[in-house]
Interface confidence: low
């Protein structure tokens, strides 16, 4: 059933003729506007109190009708002042106002707040002629009111560029309490004190707060709104909501998650990626970060020899991008890794160890004792050497590389010979005569290319020469190549 | 030290690649970010590429840019510019990060002036 | 969407004063304290200034200081000098799967 809260509405004596509360059963209002489709409202407040009009934004009509008698001041009846209800409920509320028919285009605009409501407000407009007066009724409907229909009414109506004002109807929307600020998850360290924040609003006020940690209330007090729970620490997971309660019943927040920080779990799935004489690419799956973003990780690298000293190598690096690139490591030997990180608590166990191989690597030694001597009556240089002492994990050799440059007046060319690993000697044509000829040999494995000897240099003479010697790698100690002519 | 290059002017719609450039450090080891600047406007950051994870976007950005790395490099791909893409682009290494979230961007480059317009 | 709003477009100081620069965030910013502050002087890129909300970067007089903890943080420049004339941004992580990180309007 629809109730109707209503007052009498009775004219203005100077304006004889039926009003709303005095209509006649069979009087229906001769124009109706609506400004939208109304909708039953579940609760009515009827437009006026009975006596006096309204004193406050008044018009004074200047014009006089036929007996030149001077009209009244035009102004909207008192209606109700201040609305309470519930969200969801429907209201409807209006102002009326008794307008002499000398008035053309009369015009009632409905105002919130200070703002022109427009558009789809469930606003109808009525209008009850008589001979000598007009009464308007201007009805305004909400079907299911929220908070944000809070606030100040007003009706406006402009007759001959003058404005008339009603008083406000105020429109207070109650409900359960609305929360404003919430707790937030945390994660938190060990027995460390913390805050969580609630904030609720009414209408109705005031609004009250209880803490709920695990489902149990903390406070057996309620506190006003807003409410900061200190929490002077804890030892494992909680989940917190606060309650807020007022008049018209409660409402809970969402639970909050907090987590105790720990220590993150070890990485998992280390891997290589890639791996060259002496460096290993590894790349890592970080574990639980332990509720505490990872700060750096540590690659623990130790030699998987049985015979090494068991000495384990450190890399630190950034948490991101869970790669790593281990350097300086030794050629063709196997190494144990495992990768630790840490977060603001402390270090990870170390992941499961994997195994992981350089490659053979590029000879560390050049050959020894080059010797460079020309063989005039074959025009041929001979290069005699010692092969390098080769450590094993530079891996096999496979031969050896010779750059020989030649030079003479405005000439300078170099040459590269590749030769096998079996001899230590080679035989090179000569390419210029009246020339230095000097030559550099470094050794050759699968992992690489080693350095090249010290530069040796022989003099190439023009055709003819007879006196030559060899040239050789110096003794240690000297400072250049020594030429032998 | 940070440097990048490509900006240049360019008509609307048609693709253009930034290319960022780093000495002094290793692109293995760190998170890269990009970041533009609009002529007199704020700093807004595009997004994060790391070597073990995906770029990270700013929803914004999502579809009109593409971050991508090389071993050498970083890029930045201006799919199709507008005019609104006028601004000085910024390549910056991040300090540290987890999950594509920079903690800190702790060298940047000078920045390289991209001009969109007809 | 993260938003860091610096509510102060510009803030002037006389020379060996003191001033200080407000940043809000929304939502909080990873783990509380991933709010770093830059200093951008006109023709140069920013400069990395405060980092975990009060952290000095390296090289930056401790006349820079931070504060502040999950949505509200302030810069404090003491003893403000010249050549401190400059836009200062305020910047943060956030934990969602994109939008991981924005920078604040700026204060001039």
């Known amino acids: 059933a629809i109730t109707e809260a209503r007052e009498e509405a009775k004219p203005y004596p100077l304006f004889p003729g039926p009003f709303p509360g005095s209509l006649q059963t069979d009087h229906t209002p001769l124009l109706s506007l609506p400004h939208a489709s109304g909708y039953q409202p579940a609760l009515m407040f009827s437009p006026t109190q009975p006596g006096r009009p309204h004193t406050g934004n008044v018009a004074i009509p200047q014009v006089t009708s036929v007996e030149s008698k001077p009209l009244p001041p035009l102004a909207f009846k008192h209606t109700v002042g201040h609305i309470i209800l519930s969200e969801h409920k429907g209201v409807k509320f209006n102002c009326s106002i008794s307008v002499p028919n000398i008035y053309q285009d009369t015009t009632i605009s409905w105002w919130k707040d200070g703002k022109e409501l427009l558009g789809a407000h469930h606003a109808i407009t009525q209008f009850y002629p008589d001979d000598e007066v007009t009464a308007i009724i201007a009805s305004f409907s909400i079907t299911s009111v929220q908070r944000s229909d809070n606030g100040s009414y007003i009706c406006k109506m402009k007759i001959n560029n003058e404005e008339i004002v009603s008083d406000p109807i105020y429109i207070e929307v109650q409900g359960l309490p609305h929360f404003t600020k919430q707790p937030e998850s945390m994660n938190v360290t060990r027995n460390t004190a913390f805050n969580l924040t609630c904030q609720a609003v009414g209408p109705p006020e005031p609004v009250n707060i209880f803490w709920v940690q695990n489902s149990s209330r903390v406070n057996e007090q309620p506190e006003k709104s807003p409410s900061v729970l200190t929490v002077p620490g804890l030892t494992e997971m909680a989940v917190f909501s606060c309650e807020a309660h007022n008049d018209k019943g409660l409402t809970v927040s969402k639970g909050v998650q907090i987590n105790i920080k720990a220590i993150p779990s070890p990485p998992t799935e280390v891997s290589i990626r890639n791996s060259t004489a002496h460096s290993i690419l590894i790349s890592w799956v970080p574990g639980f970060d332990g509720y505490s973003p990872f700060r750096n990780c540590s690659i623990q690298v130790k030699e998987a020899d049985p015979l090494s000293n068991g000495s384990v190598m450190i890399f630190n690096t950034s948490a991101l991008p869970h790669l790593y690139q281990i350097k300086q490591l030794q050629a063709l030997a196997n190494y144990s890794i495992g990768v630790s990180c840490m977060n603001e608590i402390g270090w990870s166990a170390v992941s499961p160890w994997i195994l992981a191989s350089t490659t053979e690597g590029a000879p560390s030694v050049a050959p020894l004792n080059v010797t460079v001597f020309l063989n005039e009556s074959s025009d041929n240089v001979d290069i005699r050497w010692m092969k390098p002492p080769t450590k094993q994990q530079d891996g096999e050799l496979v031969g050896y590389r010779i750059s020989h440059v030649w030079q003479s007046a405005g000439i300078s060319k170099e040459l590269l010979e590749e030769v096998g690993q079996n001899g230590s000697r080679a035989r090179i044509s000569v390419q210029v005569h009246n020339a230095t000829c000097t030559v550099r040999i470094a050794a050759v494995t699968r992992g690489g290319v080693g350095p090249f000897s010290d530069p040796v240099k022989i003099f190439i003479p023009a055709h003819g020469w007879v006196d030559y010697a060899p040239s050789s790698t110096p003794a240690p100690g000297n400072a250049d190549p020594v030429l032998i002519i | 030290s940070v440097e990048e290059s490509g900006g240049r002017l360019v008509t609307p719609g048609t693709p253009l690649t930034l290319t960022c450039t780093v000495s002094g450090f290793s692109l293995s080891t760190y998170s890269m970010s990009w970041v533009r600047q609009a002529p007199g406007k704020g700093l807004e950051w595009l997004g994060i590429v790391s070597v073990a994870i995906d770029p990270v976007y700013a929803t914004w950005a999502r579809g009109r840019f593409t971050i991508s790395r090389t071993s050498t490099t970083v890029n930045l791909k201006i799919t199709s510019p507008t005019t609104e893409d006028t601004a000085t682009y910024f390549c910056v290494r991040v300090a540290f990060s987890t999950n594509g979230i920079p903690h800190r961007l702790d060298l940047w480059g000078q920045g390289t002036l991209v001009t969109v317009s007809s | 969407a993260q938003v860091l709003t610096q509510t102060a477009s510009s803030v002037s100081a006389a020379v060996g004063g003191t001033v200080t620069i407000s940043c809000q965030s929304s939502p909080s910013v990873y783990n509380h304290n991933w709010l770093s502050w830059y200093q951008q002087k006109p023709g140069q890129p920013p400069k990395l200034l405060i980092y975990?909300?009060?952290k000095l970067a390296s090289g930056v007089p401790s006349r820079f200081s931070g504060s502040g903890s999950g949505t509200q943080f302030t810069l404090t420049i003491s003893d403000v000098q010249c050549d401190e004339a400059a836009t200062y941004y305020c910047?943060?992580?956030?934990?969602?799967?994109?939008?991981?990180?924005?920078f604040g309007g700026g204060t001039e």
């Open positions: 975990e909300a009060s």
């Open positions: 910047a943060g992580g956030f934990s969602s799967g994109s939008d991981s990180f924005a």
